[in-house]
Amino acid sequence: MNGRVDYLVTEEEINLTRGPSGLGFNIVGGTDQQYVSNDSGIYVSRIKENGAAALDGRLQEGDKILSVNGQDLKNLLHQDAVDLFRNAGYAVSLRVQHRLQVQNGPIGHRGEGDPSGIPIFMVLVPVFALTMVAAWAFMRYRQQL
């Protein structure tokens, strides 16, 4: 891919209820299993069909999980992170970071690569400004006709 790849980064609180077969997803990452270079965070690598996460619909492959029931996932060994999910109880609250590619092709979730992103307002503000300018120019043009 040519050029720089930028991302929209948004955070969301997702509350899942553990289903008959559990939460229904896989994770990668941790201090001993870096999935993204220079980032030991925990990422979703697979959403299982018909599992609790899939049925809820908000958690996506490539999402970074920041905390579980308020407990930070920073600087954890991979197995410790797995155990944290397994012992999280029936109702599980996930703080999740979604990263959407906004340049170089169609928008899509990214599970790997540059973990840095750009805040959503840095994209939306210029887009809004351009829209306003275009609308103003159009109105001026119509008045001249």
């Epitope: 559990g22 896989n26 299993q33 797995v82």
Partner: nanobody, 127 residues
């Protein structure tokens, strides 16, 4: 997409040994949770062995415990199945299987549905 290629099968005598290999594509091999399954003619696919991402945790079917050893080399993107004291009952097509990452639920490692990618299989015949 993950590609898996098994090798090492063949025709051996009862009591002999074989070592199967499963070579996998992808730069994130060290995150894969992996397993071996087998299928004899006219039978269901059967769990053989499982290994976690680091190789620190393994599980075996009762029928192969003490005879088979599963291992992996993350530097070579390869998983192995060392099969000793082979019996005619071990005759089957052997498949390696992969899921990316570790399930956050108690892992049902013997369930084929837990795995996303499968190799084409390698035939093991014990006479």
């Amino acid at each position: 997409q993950v590609q898996l290629v098994e090798s090492g099968g063949g025709l051996v005598q009862a009591g002999d040994s074989l070592r199967l290999s499963c070579a996998a594509s992808g730069r994130t091999f060290s995150t894969y949770t992996m397993g071996w399954f087998r299928q004899a003619p006219g039978k269901e696919r059967e769990f053989v062995a499982h290994i976690n991402w680091s190789g620190s945790s393994t599980y075996y079917a009762d029928s192969v415990k003490g005879r088979f050893t599963i291992s992996r080399d993350n530097a070579k993107n390869t998983m192995y199945l060392q099969m000793n004291s082979l019996k005619p009952d071990d005759t089957a097509v052997y498949y390696c299987a992969v899921t990316i990452g570790s399930p956050v639920d108690s892992y049902r490692h013997s369930d084929p549905l837990e795995y996303d990618y499968w190799g084409q299989g390698t035939q093991v015949t014990v006479s």
